[in-house]
Interface confidence: low
């Protein structure tokens, strides 16, 4: 085993090296000293380090460690941040397209419904967007509100166009009749099921991505303990005290130190693995009614079918509603 | 806008074309993300090794520093001696993670539970019977991915899955779309490509 080289007799080399870290030379001894006050770089003989230098080394070591950690996670952080932004944007666009398709369906097939239908469709899809972004909205309520709002217009414009415009009184009755008589058949229920399933999955997918960013940010900005700082200092900088400027830490030693410093962070590993695998499982299931793109872009068609269903049963419905909402109508005609 | 993989988005022609092949769908985009994330599955357990390999460590040198002295790289002392006189490593591990790490672990546990709850069991498909009067939605059942709607008079036909999506219209080629006269704000039809990562890396 070769003996360690003698310390730099004048500490000149150590001084010029330390000056890069800390401009101002007063902390570096002129010549090697006993170093009995040192707490980390415990000397075997004379040393070119002082207590103040040790403190600076500890601070630098912890900063180095933080930067290494940030650089380790940069690619992963970029990946998740960018995808979160991309998917959020993409989902907004799907919603916008779905709204446009639905409006186009009304314009092409039921022009007489358009002004009001556009308004109700707009409100519905605004709620869809808000829900995806985490708003506390109930999907069933959204769908019910859409059909509740649409039915009075369908009734007064398509099924019973003779009614006067001031049908405010009858509107409430029609909204109630819509549910009681299941005027749209099972279409609202179908839409509820499809929309709620697909939006729930979409929402949690975005939540998961945002949490991914939070996890990386948390570990990215960890402040390492004093104990860790001492270990790192001993590994990276204590050799300088002996004038060994160019020597590097042993590989096995580095691994032991890093495992000590990162014991807490490594505890995330189990849950991080589970996070990626669970996210994969979710993504694998995002198809058909669990795929908001598929569901929302097909919504115009289902709504169209639901209106056709009403029209198909118009005769029976008009009679029933005529009786059911008679009082409202009488009041209205008076 | 920047940071957007331009290749993710295709132009508005998709709505006019019956057969659009090969373009990227949202679901393929999701799968691609998962594949990339899976390459980071050991991220946290590999961190100590990663940091050692990215900080100065003796690789080709005969001698290395073990925290106390210069030793031969392959000697027993290379890993062991430097740990003498240090505080107990075991103690450091026993302290447990910092509060912020514990908090984030709790959040991960919670989202993992949610993700598992939400994951779709294989083969589960929505019931087909839509109402008690035996209504049938044309030829389109839930099992038919290609069909997203009937076509009443003047109904537009849409290829299932916008394959995807001009409208993040940050497609650089938006100017090249024949007959693309849709009004758009500058934000909508220009992309700052500086941070464009193609397939996000």
């Amino acid at each position: 085993q070769p003996p360690p080289p003698p310390p730099d007799a004048t500490c000149h080399q150590v001084r010029s090296f330390f000056q890069r870290l800390q401009p101002g030379l007063k902390w570096v001894p002129e010549t090697p000293v006993p170093g009995s006050d040192l707490q980390v770089c415990l000397p075997k003989g004379p040393t070119c380090c002082s207590r103040k230098m040790e403190e600076k080394y500890q601070l630098t070591a912890r900063l180095n460690m933080e930067q290494l950690l940030q650089s380790a996670s940069m690619e992963l952080k970029f990946l998740i941040i960018q995808n979160a932004a991309v998917f959020q944007e993409a989902f907004e666009i799907v919603v916008r397209h779905a709204k446009n398709y639905t409006n186009a369906m009304f314009k092409n097939n039921y022009p007489s419904l358009t002004p009001q239908a556009f308004e109700f469709v707009g409100e519905f899809f605004t709620d869809v967007s808000l829900y995806i972004l985490g708003s506390d909205i109930n999907v069933d309520d959204m769908v019910n509100e859409l059909f509740d709002s649409l039915f009075p217009v369908i009734y007064t414009q398509l099924m019973n166009p003779g009614l006067p415009d001031s049908a405010l009184d009858i509107n409430e009755c029609l909204r109630g009749a819509r549910r009681d008589l299941k005027v749209f058949g099972n279409f609202p229920k179908l839409i509820m099921t499809q929309v709620s399933k697909s939006l729930q999955v979409t929402r949690i997918f975005l939540q998961a991505l945002n949490l991914g960013i939070e996890v990386i940010n948390t570990t990215d900005h960890l402040k390492f303990s004093k104990d860790c700082g001492r270990m790192l200092t001993r590994m990276w900088y204590c050799s300088y005290c002996q004038g060994l400027m160019m020597v590097k830490p042993c590989g096995g030693y580095c691994n032991v130190v890093m495992q000590g410093c990162m014991a807490g962070v490594v505890e995330i590993d189990k849950y991080w693995r589970e996070y990626i695998l669970s996210l994969e499982e979710l993504v694998n299931g995002m198809y058909r009614i669990y795929d908001m793109e598929n569901v929302l872009l097909g919504l115009f068609s289902t709504i169209h079918d639901s209106i056709q269903y009403v029209q198909k049963n118009a005769g029976k419905l008009t009679t029933t509603i005529g009786k059911l909402c008679a009082h409202s109508q009488q009041r209205q005609y008076r | 806008s920047a940071y957007y993989p331009e290749d993710l988005f295709i132009d508005k022609k998709v709505l006019k074309v019956a057969h659009v092949e090969h373009e990227e769908t949202l679901s393929s985009r999701r799968r691609e993300l998962i594949q990339k994330l899976k390459s980071f599955i050991s991220f946290y357990s590999a961190l100590p090794g990663y940091i050692c390999s990215h900080s100065p460590v003796a690789e080709n040198d005969t001698l290395c520093w073990n925290g106390q002295e210069l030793v031969e790289r392959y000697s027993q002392k290379a890993a062991r001696n430097g740990m003498k006189n240090q505080f107990n490593l075991h103690e450091l591990k026993m302290k447990g993670p910092e509060p912020v790490v514990s908090q984030i672990i709790d959040k991960l546990k919670h989202i993992n539970q949610l993700l598992r709850t939400m994951s779709v069991p294989k083969g589960r498909v929505l019931d087909k019977n839509l109402d008690e009067e035996g209504f049938e939605s044309g030829d389109c059942g839930d099992d038919e991915d290609e069909c997203i709607g009937g076509s009443g008079d003047g109904m537009m036909k849409v290829k299932n899955q916008l394959r995807f999506l001009a409208e993040l219209a940050y497609d650089l080629d938006v100017d090249d779309v024949p007959g693309n006269n849709q009004q758009a704000t500058p934000k909508d039809n220009e992309i700052s490509t500086f941070h464009n990562l193609g397939n996000v890396h």
């Epitope: 970029f78 941040i81 932004a85 959020q88 944007e89 907004e92 | 806008s1 920047a2 940071y3 331009e6 290749d7 650089l172 080629d173 500058p186 934000k187 220009e190 992309i191 700052s192 490509t193 500086f194 941070h195 464009n196 990562l197 193609g198 397939n199 996000v200 890396h201």
Partner: antibody, heavy 107, light 108 residues
Framework: QVQLVQSGAEVKKPGASVKVSCKAS????????ISWVRQAPGQRLEWMGW????????KYSQKFQGRVTITRDTSASTAYMELSSLRSEDTAVYYC?????WGQGTL | EIVLTQSPLSLPVTPGEPASISCRSS???????????LDWYLQKPGQSPQILIY???HRASGVPDRFSGSASGTDFTLKISRVEAEDVGVYYC?????????FGGGTK
Amino acid sequence: QVQLVQSGAEVKKPGASVKVSCKASGYTFTSYGISWVRQAPGQRLEWMGWINAGNGNTKYSQKFQGRVTITRDTSASTAYMELSSLRSEDTAVYYCATVVYWGQGTL
Amino acid sequence: EIVLTQSPLSLPVTPGEPASISCRSSQSLLHSNGYNYLDWYLQKPGQSPQILIYLGSHRASGVPDRFSGSASGTDFTLKISRVEAEDVGVYYCMQALQTPLTFGGGTK
């Protein structure tokens, strides 16, 4: 480690053309877009244009439209910027850049 | 095109002191996804620019945490909590919302 290495300095006469190369390494070349940015003495940085290294799509600044051509050779992981009809005011340092990384510049 | 106005033109600072650089945009750089598409770069003497902050407030890898970015409407600020000698150079802001990409005039 990601690196963008540019070709060396050039001296050209007015009216001539110049072609600067930018060799990428340390990442998948086709995964990044590459921008070209120039900096004339004492002037602010000026974006000239961009190429999608994956599919070759380009976008140019209006100011340079018609004079600048950006191309890439995926097999060589290299992007090129050609500027024609040179004028004295084109004297500048020309940089290629990806997300975070910049070339060393070409005068 | 979007115009970015940086101030001050020059900022003499003593090491250890804080510093703040402002960048005002002629229009909002806030995307509908909630991110501000503004980046900060530092160009040290004789070097290429290097990224400090992206998407308004995200610190790039290896950038010391004394650097931070913030936004208020169309006003963006780069702050250095404690300036060090190595921070000397010209700082540029750059908008990445739409082409042409544009840069601020720089703060020395």
